[in-house]
C-alpha cells in the first residue's frame, strides 16, 4: 500500500493529479464507523469542509483526498479530522513551465559517480492501475526504451549520462487524460573512492618552547569521511592534566575529501614535557600515518639544525 503523506509542507505542479493520504489509515476498523472530515483553509476562508460537491475535481476516499487535477487555487492548508486525531498539511501549487517538459522547482537532484551503477526506474505505485503508458525523457527528448509501462535505465554511469530525466505517466480518469511528471537532475562526478590519508608537513618537528609557557601543536591531514585523527601521548605515564586535545576542525575539499586539523594544547610546560614524543596519527581502514613533535627548550636550540624547527 502507498505510504501516507507525512511531510507537512508540500509543493506540487498545477494540472497534475495529486493526493493527500492521512497517517491514521491503518486504523481501518475504526475508520468504518467514525466520522471523518477534510477541511481546507486559505487566506480568505477559515476551515471550509471539503466534499465531492465542493468541486468536481475533488474525490474523497477512506484515507485519501484526491485532486483531478490540482490547480493554483488549491494552494492552502488542509486538515483531516477523525475523533481526536488531526493531521495538517500546507499545500503550495506552483505554475507549470509551459516551455519545458518539466518544472525546475520540482526536480530531485542526484549525484552519481562515474563507472558506478546508475538506475532510473519510472514507477508510480498510487496511480499504477490507472496508468496507460509511461515515457522517459532525457533533457525533454523521448528515450526509446523496451518497456512502456515502467521504463528503466540500468547501467554503469558515464559523463554523457548527465542531464534531466523526466518520467511522464499518462493516465485516464473519468474520460479525461492526465499526466504526472517526476524529474531527476543527474550529475555525474569523478570517482570519489578512498584516498590513503596523509598528514601534512614534516614527519618530525622540533618545537622551541619556554618552561611555564603554553604551546599549541597543530596537526593537519587530508583524509576520507570515515577516517580519524588523534594525538597519542602519555600512554605510559597516564594523562597529564596540562595537556588538552582541542576539537577537530573539518572542511570538505572540492574533490569530496576532508581537510582535518587537530590541535594539542600543552599548558604550563614543565621539564616532563621536554624531549618526549607527541605523536599525531591519522587512521583509516587502509593504514595509518603518524607525525611526531618534540618540545625542546629554547636555550638548547643551538644544538639542533635550523631546518628541523617548527615555530
Amino acid at each position: 500500500a502507498e505510504s501516507c503523506t507525512s511531510r507537512p509542507h508540500i509543493t506540487v505542479v498545477e494540472g497534475e493529479p495529486f493526493y493527500l493520504k492521512h497517517c491514521s489509515c491503518s486504523l481501518a476498523h475504526e475508520i468504518e464507523t467514525t466520522t471523518k472530515s477534510w477541511y481546507k483553509s486559505s487566506g480568505s476562508q477559515e476551515h471550509v469542509e471539503l466534499n465531492p460537491r465542493s468541486s468536481s475535481r475533488i474525490a474523497l476516499h477512506d484515507c485519501v483526498l484526491e485532486f483531478w487535477p490540482v490547480e493554483l487555487n488549491d494552494t492552502g492548508s488542509y486538515f483531516f479530522q477523525m475523533k481526536n486525531y488531526t493531521q495538517k498539511w500546507k499545500l503550495n501549487v506552483i505554475r507549470r513551465n509551459k516551455h519545458s517538459c518539466f518544472t525546475e522547482r520540482q526536480v530531485t537532484s542526484k549525484i552519481v559517480e562515474v563507472k558506478k551503477f546508475f538506475q532510473i526506474t519510472c514507477e508510480n505505485s498510487y496511480y499504477q492501475t490507472l496508468v496507460n503508458s509511461t515515457s522517459l525523457y532525457k533533457n525533454c527528448k523521448k528515450l526509446l526504451l523496451e518497456n512502456n509501462k515502467n521504463p528503466t535505465i540500468k547501467k554503469n554511469a558515464e559523463f554523457e549520462d548527465q542531464g534531466y530525466y523526466s518520467c511522464v505517466h499518462f493516465l485516464h480518469h473519468n474520460g479525461k487524460l492526465f499526466n504526472i511528471t517526476k524529474t531527476f537532475n543527474i550529475t555525474i562526478v569523478e570517482d570519489r573512492s578512498n584516498i590513503v590519508p596523509v598528514l601534512l608537513g614534516p614527519k618530525l618537528n622540533h618545537v622551541a618552547v619556554e618552561l611555564g609557557k603554553n604551546v599549541r601543536l597543530n596537526c593537519s591531514a587530508l583524509l576520507n569521511e570515515e577516517d580519524v585523527i588523534y594525538w597519542m601521548f602519555g600512554e605510559e605515564n597516564g594523562s597529564d592534566p596540562n595537556i588538552h586535545e582541542e576539537k577537530e576542525m573539518r572542511i570538505m575539499t572540492p574533490e569530496g575529501k576532508w581537510h582535518a586539523s587537530k590541535v594539542l594544547r600543552i599548558e604550563n610546560i614543565g621539564e616532563s614535557n621536554l624531549n618526549v614524543l607527541y605523536n599525531c596519527t591519522v587512521a583509516s581502514t587502509g593504514g595509518t600515518d603518524t607525525k611526531s613533535f618534540i618540545l625542546v627548550r629554547k636555550a638548547d636550540m643551538a644544538d639542533i639544525p635550523g631546518h628541523v624547527f617548527t615555530r
Partner: nanobody
Amino acid sequence: EVQLVESGGGLVQPGGSLRLSCVASGSIFSINGMGWYRQAPQAPGKQRELVARITSGGSTIYATSVKGRFTISRDNAKNTVYLQMDNLKPDDTAVYYCNIYGGALWPWGQGTQVTVSS
C-alpha cells in the same frame, strides 16, 4: 573479516549513567589498543572524536571533555571493550563507536546511540 558490535546506548537524563560494550569478532583483540569514538549530531561528514582509549597493556587516556566521568576497560578473554559513562551531559549526545587505537582501523560497526536529555 573483523566485526565490531556496539551496544548499551539509550536515552538517559543529565547526571545519569550508561555502560557501553563493544565485542570484536574474528580478531587478535588483545594485541591492539582500543578506543571509543563518538560522532556528534552536528559533526561535519562522519567526523568522529576519540574520547577514551586503552592500550594493550591497559593504560588509559581520556579526552578533556570526559575526564573524570568516563572509564574505559577491556576484557581480552571476551574480546570486549567497555565504556562506563557517569554524570552524563547533553553534550555527550552522539553515536558511540569502538575501533582500533594506534593502528589501521577495522570496518566501523553500526554504533550505539546515546541521547542525554531531560
